[in-house]
């Protein structure tokens, strides 16, 4: 039984990074709700003075790809492509270290924004990571 669906990205907030590419959604009508959540999150991020340029340059597309993961076209069943673990770790530990610390201690941000957990992603050299999304 299929757990989710592959459908063209129909929003606008992440269109610059995703275009009309096919994304994985857990239900057919989930896109709209996630679009509303991510625009609310971006508004909050933009209002915050805690986000550096070097972080936002990579964090924004990463959040888009995390919220709207590309479909794995090599799979016979609908399946999302993961972010690449090495890039996720660079983002969390180097480029956005201060921002992550702030975000993880801020309930308002956590409520609106699901941050990727790098430890959940496959190891760089594993077969599962071969098709990961590079920012």
């Amino acid at each position: 039984e299929e757990d989710g669906f592959c459908q063209p990205y129909r929003g606008i907030a992440c269109a610059r990074f995703i275009g009309n590419r096919t994304v994985y959604m857990e239900s057919l009508h989930m896109q709209g709700e996630i679009e509303n959540q991510i625009t609310a999150a971006f508004t909050m991020i933009g209002t915050s003075s805690h986000l550096s340029d070097k972080c936002s340059q990579f964090a924004i597309p990463s959040l888009c790809h995390y919220a709207f993961p590309y479909c794995d076209e090599t799979s016979s069943v609908p399946k999302p492509r993961d972010l690449c673990r090495d890039e996720c770790e660079i983002l969390e530990n180097v480029l956005c270290q201060t921002e992550y610390i702030f975000a993880r201690s801020n309930p308002m941000i956590l409520m609106r924004l699901k941050l990727p957990n790098c430890e959940d992603l496959p190891q760089p050299e594993s077969p599962e990571a071969a098709n990961c999304i590079r920012i």
Partner: antibody, heavy 117, light 107 residues
């Protein structure tokens, strides 16, 4: 108070260009998608284009793709619609509107664009 | 593109009447439908979003409902200020599309 004010409309010859402006106030401009919707005289509403200023992401109707360009200047809280290669069928009142949970909750008063020789 | 077929194109009604306007989507749009009211020479005003959510400040006599790909705007008791043109709009996918409009006139 949320406000959207369009300007830049006028009479232009076929093949000509025009740039419309939409000045926004009363809300966090970059966090909302801004749309342009037009209405030909005596006709219905037609969605034209949209921009999400925070990521500079854009979308266009097929009828204007390649001729119109939507942009935004977050320092001025203003969205623009650059219209090139104008045709008679582009004659309409052009409204800018703010996206609220993906419906349009605030609209400007509209600006008339007339394409005629 | 998703087509929104609105009916009727016009109707005549009296103050106090119950008025129903329907929109049919050419494919599934979930509940991503809004309804607007427009008066001559004015910008449209949002009435309903997400098929049935009443927008802030809109009188409760306006309501929206969904049944599959059919969407309905109901005015429970028509008031003099309700005579206008009404449009439905889908926002599940770009390009966003509007219905052709329904003009509500005084009988």
């Amino acid at each position: 108070e949320v406000q959207l004010v369009e300007s830049g409309g006028g009479l232009v010859q076929p093949g000509g260009s025009l740039r419309l402006s939409c000045a926004a106030s009363g809300f966090t401009f970059y966090g909302y998608t801004i749309h342009w919707v037009r209405q030909a005289p005596g006709k219905g509403l037609e969605w034209v284009a949209a921009i999400y200023p925070y990521t500079d992401s854009t979308r266009y109707a097929d009828s204007v793709k390649g001729r119109f360009t939507i942009s935004a200047d977050t320092s001025k809280n203003t969205a623009y619609l650059q219209m090139n290669s104008l045709r008679a069928e582009d004659t309409a009142v052009y409204y800018c509107a703010r996206d609220y949970r993906r419906a349009l909750d605030y609209w400007g008063q509209g600006t008339l664009v007339t394409v005629s020789s | 593109d998703i087509q929104m077929t609105q009916s009727p194109s016009s109707l005549s009604a009296s103050v106090g009447d119950r008025v129903t306007i329907t929109c049919r989507a050419s494919q599934s749009v979930s509940s991503a439908v809004a309804w607007y009211q427009q008066k001559p020479g004015k910008a449209p005003k949002l009435l309903i979003y997400s098929a049935s959510s009443l927008y802030s400040g809109v009188p409760s006599r306006f309501s929206g409902s969904r049944s599959g790909t059919d969407f309905t705007l109901t005015i429970s008791s028509l008031q003099p200020e309700d005579f206008a043109t009404y449009y439905c709009q889908q926002y599940t996918d770009f390009p966003w599309t509007f219905g052709q409009g329904t003009k509500v006139e005084i009988k």
